[in-house]
Each structure stands twice: as C-alpha cells, then as structure tokens.
Amino acid sequence: GELETSDVVTVVLGQDAKLPCFYRGDSGEQVGQVAWARVDAGEGAQELALLHSKYGLHVSPAYEGRVEQPPPPRNPLDGSVLLRNAVQADEGEYECRVSTFPAGSFQARLRLRVLVPPLPSLNPGPALEEGQGLTLAASCTAEGSPAPSVTWDTEVKGTTSSRSFKHSRSAAVTSEFHLVPSRSMNGQPLTCVVSHPGLLQDQRITHILHVSFLAEASVRGLEDQNLWHIGREGAMLKCLSEGQPPPSYNWTRLDGPLPSGVRVDGDTLGFPPLTTEHSGIYVCHVSNEFSSRDSQVTVDVLDPQEDSGKQVDLVSAS
C-alpha cells in the first residue's frame, strides 16, 4: 500500500486547513492508528493528534480544541484531520505516520502554507498646488504573506516608486505615486490596487485628487466700447476666473471709491444709468487660499454729444 497526501496545503488566515493522509492499501489491510506531528526543520517533532481505530481521536494539549476529524461518513483508511482557524504560526511542515496491519508503518509529509491577506492603507501626500514640481500624491502600503503586489490605476500621468520590507511573518510593500500637479487633475481618481493570492479579487482604494490653482483673471463687458455712453442702463462688468478652492471676488476703483449706485454682486459690477462719473479704472481682485489675481479695466463713458469716440484700455495683471 501507499500513503496519499498533498505536497502543499494552502489556506487563508482564519480558515480551516484539511491535512490529508489516506492509506491506499490492499484488500484486507487495516489502519491501526495515525499520528500527526509538526516537524519543522531544526526543531523536534511536536505531536498534534493521534487517531486510533478503536479509541478515536486524542488531541495533544497544545492543539486542544483545534484539531478534529473530518465530518462523517469516514473511511477507516482515512487519517486526515482538520486544523481549525489556521494562524500564521501554523505554517510549516507536518507529518502523518500510519500504522497498518499487516503491512507495517508508512509516513508522509506535507507543507501547510497560511496566506495572510493584506489590509492596505492609502495615505495622501501634502496638499497639491499647481506650479509645484514633482510631488507625492499618495502612498499605499500593504502587508501580507506572501508579499502583496501594489500598483496604481489612474489616467493621471505620474511616476511610481516602491519599497519592500521583510517582517517576522510577512512582507510589507509600499508604493508612492508622484506627479506634477496641474488643474486638469482636479477630481481625477488615483486608485491603489493590491493583489494577493489570499484575496478573491484585487483590493482597490481610491483617492480623489485635489489640486489648488487660480486662473488668470479677466474682465468682460467692455467688448463694445460704444455701448458705454451716458444714459445707458444695465451696464455691467463681469470678472472671469476659476480656481480650486473656488475663488472670491472683490471690486475696487483705482482712482477713488466706487461711485454711488454701483452694485457689487460677487463677480459682477452693476451700474446705474451711466454718467461721466462712472468713468475710471476698475479693479477686479480674485483670491482663494492658494493665490490671488488682479485684472483692471478703464471705463470711459462716452458723451453722444461729442463726435470722437475714446479709447478703452484693458489691462490684466497678476
């Protein structure tokens, strides 16, 4: 006869491990007992359990409550056992020794491999700002046994670097994603993907990128200078910019206070019926936590009585 077992039994941390040991003998042969022991190299054998054909299962104190026979129906030639709730410390070599009648003793070894699935964590880098050079966007760390694989899934252009660290019963991998921040990256997902044989599917952690920026400011409303004449109603200037975080707007007049009747409504400056008093240099000041920008325009209110139109200057400054 001969013993049938597996070279390697692989289980995920916390699962039950079936340690197979089946005696395939000739007809009439009987199994008297099966002894299971742990036999890691460099250490003496440590008994797990003894399966006796007459007296049943005896589990050694170190494995009390953790070793069982598989559920019935049971074949009398089957010496397999279940190791409940496998932990990392269970990983190693195991041996089953089968005493048969009349063929004698047989032994076989197997290796138990306990997979420890990683619990990845993603740590965002510092605040991203447009104009920075290559900057850490996020780092992702996963530790397990065996070492997990850590990659990135994103449409954003960047560079990655990885380090791995060997620990007592596992290996850790950390990967960093660096990029040159630009406003187009705002709201883009950056996903850390962790693969491991103990996972049914890849684990994914997504970080949404936020890049602070402030666009140049410009002022609309003076495109047709001929509309800016005495008596015109509904004249307005609109300040154009965009930013992250969203900017706030402030209007001032460079050559004095804002004329009475002029209304400030966020990015818009509304005028009452125009008079020559409304001529002047107006400044739109745009700011957010990241930066500030200015744009100034010169308003020249035309008097229809006069023939010659006057120039209108647009100046943008930051």
Epitope: Q88, V116, L119, S121, N123, G125, L136, S139, C140, T141, E143, G144, S161, R163, F165, K166, H167, S168, R169, S170, A172, T174, E176
Partner: antibody, heavy 118, light 107 residues
Framework: QVQLVQSGAEAKKPGASVRVSCKTS????????IHWVRQAPGQGLEWMGI????????SYAQKFQDRVTMTRDTSTNTDYMDLSSLRFEDTAVYYC???????????WGQGTMVTVSS | DIQLTQSPSFLSASVGDKVTITCRAS??????LAWYQQKPGKAPKLLIY???TLQGGVPSRFSGSGSGTEFTLTISNLQPADFATYCC?????????FGPGTKVDIK
Amino acid sequence: QVQLVQSGAEAKKPGASVRVSCKTSGYTFTNYYIHWVRQAPGQGLEWMGIINPTLDSTSYAQKFQDRVTMTRDTSTNTDYMDLSSLRFEDTAVYYCARSAGFDAFDIWGQGTMVTVSS
Amino acid sequence: DIQLTQSPSFLSASVGDKVTITCRASQGINSYLAWYQQKPGKAPKLLIYSASTLQGGVPSRFSGSGSGTEFTLTISNLQPADFATYCCQQLNSYPFTFGPGTKVDIK
C-alpha cells in the same frame, strides 16, 4: 488630539528585563505602524524596530534581535516593548513613534527613561 | 546598514541668519529621508519628509532638498525657537538609521 503616552521611568539592575508601554489615542490604531527608538544620554537616536498594527509581525534592528520583543494589545490600543538581559549601556530614553506606512515618524511619545545600574 | 553623516556637527548662528545642514548617506536612498528637530528633554519633532515635503504646521522657513546620497536642510531667517539639534533619518531600508545630529546654538 493624536497622542502617544508612555509609561513612567524605570530603574533596573543589569541582567533584568524592562517593559515600556505606549498607549495611543486620537486615531485609528490599526492604520499606523509603531516604532521604538532609543537615545542614550548625550547620544543620537537609534531605531530598535517596528511592529505591524494589524498582523503583529515585527522587524528588529540586528543589534537588538535577541533581546527585544514588541507586542500590542488592540483592546487597549497599547503597544509594548520588552528588553531583556539589560546592560549598563541600555541606559537611555526609549521613545515610541508612529508612522503611516513607511513614512517618517509624525507623532512621538514623551519618552521613558530606563536606568540600568547595580 | 545605511550610515548617515551630518555636517557640521555644531553650528553657531544669529537670529535672522540662513543656516544649511547637510546629510550624506552611505548608499542611495532615493528621496526617503526625513529631518527632525529635537530640544533638550523633549521628543523629536518631524519637520520634513520625502526629502523636501514640509510637514503640516511647520513654518515655511524650513526647507529640504536632495536625493540619492546628498541632502540639505535649510533654515532661512533663523528664529529664537529654532535653536535646537537637527537630525536626518533614512526610510529606504531596515534598519531605519538616524544621523548623529547637528546642534544649532546662539552665536
């Protein structure tokens, strides 16, 4: 706020063992690694080892490999560092510090003075 | 193990000065370097990580640069609170080692 609070000063004889504790609060315990660092009087900082927050796996500096044990108790959010076979040269301030992944140590305990003398 | 050396080991400076401290690694560590400030009887405080990234809440007069084997910590416009010992740390591989430190005191 985030805090790492260490146990009080210890005086030990050569050959004895010491246990230093580090109680963490203000953050999710399992998301950070804990390191132990020591500093002998008038000397620089010396990294002793690291413990994984979720797996109990460790890595120790070679120098301490045979004498140090780092453990944790998730029920109380406390880490422990045991150092055995103490020598005079183990007299130092022992710090615990946390790191997110393998980044720099952003929060440190206040330190525990361990004095070894006969 | 990766060795870190710092220069100078001692530095005298005045308030308002610009101070530069160098840290050299015995082998390449990419940008996996941190800088700490330590005052007597206190735990170290993180200033810079990833060689050049300023830790939140740290004044912008502190800056870091370098990669590979040579790194620099610069304090522009030195303030009274900055008189302390500064040390670097590599996080490229185990064991994570520290530099011996640079003591900055008042001239």
